[in-house]
Interface confidence: medium
């Protein structure tokens, strides 16, 4: 059974992941980002179901495409460092989903823009955090 300390750690990791995802979203979903129009043409795979920590496998598998799109956004008005950011997210995701069981991610039929993708995972984090508090 999960202890209160492990629950607290999970909550903190989710909050960290949530902040990272929100920071990316705020950085790109900015109508003064001249790269936004191009970034919205890239498609991301969405999870068919995302209700448990193991479903973070679906996020992990999309981190490389996410980094590639973020590399497009580099400009003097956009100070995210994609490689560092994605690396941090990857570490958190690996810890949260665990590596004991292998989970095959199931994707929805419809792909999504980077904004929809980030919003989906932000909602996921918020939902799990609310069940822990």
């Amino acid at each position: 059974a999960p202890t209160s300390s492990s629950t607290k750690k999970t909550q903190l990791q989710l909050e960290h992941l949530l902040l990272d995802l929100q920071m990316i979203l705020n950085g790109i979903n900015n109508y003064k980002n001249p790269k936004l129009t191009r970034m919205l043409t890239f498609k991301f795979y969405m999870p068919k179901k995302a209700t448990e920590l193991k479903h973070l496998q679906c996020l992990e598998e999309e981190l490389k495409p996410l980094e590639e799109v973020l590399n497009l956004a580099q400009s003097k008005n956009f100070h995210l460092r994609p490689r560092d950011l994605i690396s941090n997210i990857n570490v958190i995701v690996l810890e949260l989903k665990g590596s004991e069981t292998t989970f095959m991610c199931e994707y929805a039929d419809e792909t999504a823009t980077i904004v929809e993708f980030l919003n989906r995972w932000i909602t996921f984090c918020q939902s799990i955090i609310s069940t822990l508090t």
Epitope: Y31, K32, P34, V115
Partner: antibody, heavy 122, light 108 residues
Framework: EVQLLESGAEVKKPGASVKVSCKAS????????MHWVRQAPGQGLEWMGI????????SYAQKFQGRVTMTRDTSTSTVYMELSSLRSEDTAVYYC???????????????WGQGTMVTVSS | EIVLTQSPGTLSLSPGERATLSCRAS???????LAWYQQKPGQAPRLLIY???NRATGIPDRFSGSGSGADFTLTISRLEPEDFAVYYC?????????FGGGTKVEIK
């Protein structure tokens, strides 16, 4: 006096394109972002996109991606909005609106053009 | 996208009365990037309030804005004949920029 003067009314057939102009005067053209907003008859306001007159960079609302092109001509202090593949639902008044620069990175629209009526009808 | 819901749809009041217009956002509007515009028939919108509570240049002090987060209010303390128009709220801190559906203030 700060002013935005838009081009005259247009009547277009479905499938055609329309290009609306907006000439700025009374201020430094390249110092303010310009937006386009449209309003269908009897309806509310809908944001279409933004152009930075200084560098010419643009961002468009997803709804108009692939159909709208915003450009500018710094020599005449004019911005343009071209909408292609017109359909009847595009019948609206099209406004250019200047984004102010009084309070940081994001600002409200302090100056509006008088609007250009675009009618799409077969 | 942030959806802005304005209420009521129509407000029937007499000159001299107080008008209270509401704008509710589907999610928090960052840094109070919320504006109010007035539009009269056949005219372009005119900026009244920006940053939720700041009056634009030349706007009479009977117009005031308040609120934060997801709930905002435009108040006209004493309606003048020229105030009867449609009022729109707008959020301009998140792409796409969005407007509310409008509130029509009409003479009772």
């Amino acid at each position: 006096e700060v002013q935005l003067l838009e081009s005259g009314a247009e009547v277009k057939k479905p499938g055609a394109s329309v290009k609306v102009s907006c000439k700025a005067s009374g201020y430094t053209f390249t110092s303010y972002y310009m937006h386009w907003v449209r309003q269908a008859p009897g309806q509310g306001l809908e944001w279409m996109g933004i152009i930075n007159p200084s560098g010419g960079s643009t961002s468009y609302a997803q709804k108009f991606q692939g159909r709208v092109t915003m450009t500018r001509d710094t020599s005449t202090s004019t911005v343009y909005m071209e909408l292609s593949s017109l359909r009847s639902e595009d019948t609206a008044v099209y406004y250019c609106a200047r984004e102010g620069n009084s309070s940081g990175y994001y600002n409200a629209f302090d100056i509006w053009g008088q609007g250009t009526m675009v009618t799409v009808s077969s | 996208e942030i959806v802005l819901t304005q209420s009521p749809g129509t407000l029937s009041l007499s000159p001299g009365e107080r008008a209270t217009l509401s704008c509710r956002a589907s999610q928090s509007v960052s840094s109070s990037y919320l504006a109010w515009y007035q539009q009269k028939p056949g005219q372009a919108p005119r900026l009244l309030i920006y940053g939720a509570s700041n009056r634009a240049t030349g706007i009479p002090d009977r117009f005031s804005g308040s609120g934060s987060g997801a709930d905002f209010t435009l108040t006209i303390s004493r309606l003048e004949p020229e105030d009867f128009a449609v009022y729109y709220c707008q959020q301009y801190g998140s792409s796409p920029l969005t407007f509310g559906g409008g509130t029509k203030v009409e003479i009772k």
